[in-house]
Interface confidence: low
């Protein structure tokens, strides 16, 4: 049973804290560091031995609306000759991020935090070999 | 979540933008909890561009613990288990959204913050710069 909870009750509440209804929290969605840019090496998705493609998912009831997902292009890895080597495996690397979900319930709107699993890229691994007796 | 009544008449027109401040439920909905992988994995060790995980802890943030990947080698591990410097291990970075307590130390008041994390490493062919 996983019940991810955000607010730990042991935090000493300063006088300046805004009043919040029970069971909820106030969330300012003006993003800190909004204009920060990823400084990854150029075109690593194409130059990797476990290359991947990107697709953009879009949902107007999610904030942010755009989430980019990677998909490994191959099951195997690309060797020095540019051929796929199926003795190795391309595997996805994933990371969780938070999004805000807007839900319509009749004529009302509610907001819910949600964890989204993002595939960030792929890496080449030695496979786990299962020996059958 | 916390229900916010809409204007009387309940117009069909969809709000294009999210309000700047919203009230949300303390419980985080996790759509991935149903996935039940049969075995655990250790890609960080088995990768040809292996990485170590470094703990980044900040009680004013949720999640309070984030793990940063640091590539172990400049090169990649070849079939013989040696580091091949003709290839490069590079970090895969991702922008993620976290919650920052604002004002500080408040238990139930947050602001979204974008942070850059290195999630793992991948092996790439290097960009060779030919000098004229």
């Amino acid at each position: 049973r996983k019940i991810p909870k955000v607010g730990h009750t042991f935090f000493q509440k300063p006088e300046s804290c805004p009043p919040v209804p029970g069971g909820s929290m106030k969330l300012d969605i003006g993003i800190i560091n909004e204009n920060q840019r990823v400084s990854m090496s150029r075109n690593i998705e194409s130059r990797s031995t476990s290359p991947w493609n990107y697709t953009v998912t879009w949902d107007p009831n999610r904030y942010p609306s755009e989430v980019v997902q990677a998909q490994c292009r191959n099951l195997g890895c690309i060797n020095a000759q540019g051929k796929e080597d199926i003795s190795m495996n391309s595997v996805p690397i994933q990371q969780e991020t938070l999004v805000v979900r807007r839900k319509h319930q009749g004529c009302s709107v509610s907001f819910q935090l949600e964890k989204v699993l993002v595939t960030v890229g792929c890496t080449c691994v030695t496979p786990v070999i299962h020996h059958v007796q | 979540g916390i229900t916010i009544p809409r204007n009387p008449g309940c117009p069909n027109s969809e709000d294009k933008n999210f309000p700047r401040t919203v009230m949300v439920n303390l419980n985080i909905h996790n759509r991935n909890t149903n996935t039940n992988p049969k075995r655990s994995s250790d890609y960080y060790n088995r990768s040809t561009s292996p990485w170590n995980l470094h703990r980044n802890e900040d009680p004013e943030r949720y999640p309070s613990v984030i793990w940063e990947a640091k590539c172990r080698h400049l090169g990649c591990i070849n079939a013989d288990g040696n580091v091949d410097y003709h290839m490069n291990s590079v970090p895969i970075q991702q922008e993620i959204l976290v919650l920052r307590r604002e004002p500080p130390h408040c238990p139930n008041s947050f602001r979204l913050e974008k942070i850059l994390v290195s999630v793992g490493c991948t092996c790439v062919t290097p960009i060779v710069h030919h000098v004229a």
């Epitope: 049973r1 996983k2 019940i3 991810p4 909870k5 730990h8 595997v91 996805p92 690397i93 994933q94 990371q95 969780e96 699993l117 | 996935t35 992988p37 049969k38 075995r39 655990s40 994995s41 250790d42 890609y43 995980l53 703990r55 802890e57 949720y62 999640p63 309070s64 613990v65 984030i66 793990w67 999630v119």
Partner: nanobody
Framework: EVQLVESGGGLVQPGGSQRLSCTAS????????MGWYRQAPGKQRELVAL???????DYADSVKGRFTISRDNSKNTVYLQMNSLRPEDTAVYYC??????????????????WGQGTLVTVSS
């Protein structure tokens, strides 16, 4: 998957002592926070005590000076030593943990997990 298993509940006399323990199992990389919450009949679940990976601890005001939380990182276990127990301490005690772990190639950071709960009854 991560499991939390509590033990040590039972019937105790007022003024008596009891020790609860909780062990986390699974493919755990690191445990950030472990702790105890309790829920008395008809009441909300409330924090009892938490202990961080660095060893620092936090307690609810109602148990300060009476309860002590500790952990054994090598065993992924957290303990709650409860002294000078009072009838109002009667509750189901739940172990909680924020754990980073690998599962199926995915790294899950700071997932909150809960045990099934162990009943502590303080009565003469």
């Amino acid at each position: 998957e991560v499991q939390l298993v509590e033990s040590g509940g039972g019937l105790v006399q007022p003024g008596g002592s009891q020790r609860l323990s909780c062990t986390a199992s699974g493919t755990i990389v690191n445990i950030h926070v472990m702790g105890w919450y309790r829920q008395a009949p008809g009441k909300q679940r409330e924090l009892v005590a938490l202990i961080f990976s660095g060893g620092s601890a936090d307690y609810a005001d109602s148990v300060k000076g009476r309860f002590t939380i500790s952990r054994d990182n090598s065993k992924n276990t957290v303990y709650l030593q409860m002294n000078s127990l009072r009838p109002e301490d009667t509750a189901v005690y739940y172990c909680a943990a924020e754990i980073g772990y690998y599962s199926g190639g995915t790294y899950y950071s700071s997932e909150a997990h809960w045990g099934q709960g162990t009943l502590v009854t303080v009565s003469s």
